[in-house]
Amino acid sequence: QGGAAEGVQIQIIYFNLETVQVTWNASKYSRTNLTFHYRFNGDEAYDQCTNYLLQEGHTSGCLLDAEQRDDILYFSIRNGTHPVFTASRWMVYYLKPSSPKHVRFSWHQDAVTVTCSDLSYGDLLYEVQYRSPFDTEWQSKQENTCNVTIEGLDAEKCYSFWVRVKAMEDVYGPDTYPSDWSEVTCWQRGEIRDACAETPTPPKPKLSK
């Protein structure tokens, strides 16, 4: 996302269509308080950032309120009055949805339905990953609403689950960010567990009749 202008690298993250974070890495200005100036309308004057991020005592980014889904962010990073990086970007390219909230599990025999609160905007994928200690890799299933049913589970095994939200690539482009994962929750026989054993426990011997 960054640019080669005077060695300034930038990163933009649009958190949940609400807040934009622009961070910069400028080796040439590593001990300088660069200032961030922005506008959402190309006709307006630039405003200066009022919520800077600091790294080692120097400005390294800015957080902006931006609850305007379709808009463009025009910005300029300056050393005094001298612009060192100027750009304008469609903010939705850098969308990062918020982490799933109110995650719930509903068990029925060998299947579980994972639900959570849908976000207020669309064109998202809700991904559930799960594994048991017997699995070498996470399994994954995703739907376009937060209502994901996973079938074919073994009721005797302990499964770990976590959930995240991703922006659909066909809509938002390929350079968005997935949400942070929800907390891992562990389940066995339809009941929540503190954790799943790292090493699989051997199956119980069957009692002969």
């Epitope: 996302q1 960054g2 379709d70 304008s88 469609w90 064109d123 690539e169 390929p174 350079d175």
Partner: antibody, heavy 122, light 107 residues
Amino acid sequence: QVQLVESGGGLVKPGGSLRLSCAASGFSITTSGYYWTWIRQFPGKGLEWMGYIGYNSKTYYNPALKSRITISRDNAKNSLYLQMNSLRAEDTAVYYCARSLYGGYKDAFDSWGQGTLVTVSS
Amino acid sequence: EIVMTQSPATLSVSPGERATLSCRASQSIGTSLHWYQQKPGQAPRLLIKFASRSITGIPARFSGSGSGTEFTLTISSLQSEDFAVYYCQQSPGFPPTFGQGTKLEIK
């Protein structure tokens, strides 16, 4: 399959105005998620994006042209329009209308009209 | 605005050979780079979206790669109908901008 047909091009005097039309068929211009754009191509073959109008009627314009152009649409006629004022010789170009990929204003353009030539000369 | 620079301006290649066209962005654009083909008297046609994603109906000999500021369009085995002008376009920057084009001609 969307088809786009531009019209309204021709010879215009410097300082004059033009209104180009783009008739869409096979697809509604109000379909959610799609944006419609005007792009022009100069005689030297360079391409310039001029502006968008969205399914929601929201418009965006190239800052270099913003003071001189207006993009509008007529849903009943399933058509888009480009109004351009204060024309100069350097506005001589082939003018295309095009549709963005689903997902909106921000992407590539997957359907184009055949273009209409505008010549600005006295 | 983001400046797109294509090279070379003209590329001469024999039919059946491989062609490699380059596009450079003045700022990093991730993978939001698109390629078009234009033949004389026709409108541009979208070939590749988002640097490497294929478009329905476009022959498999067309492929794209790259991210950040450096991008490449490769035509694996040139057919007679591939001789045309090719443009790249970036989309995350506002306004969207195109390269000046590479003319692919028969050697």
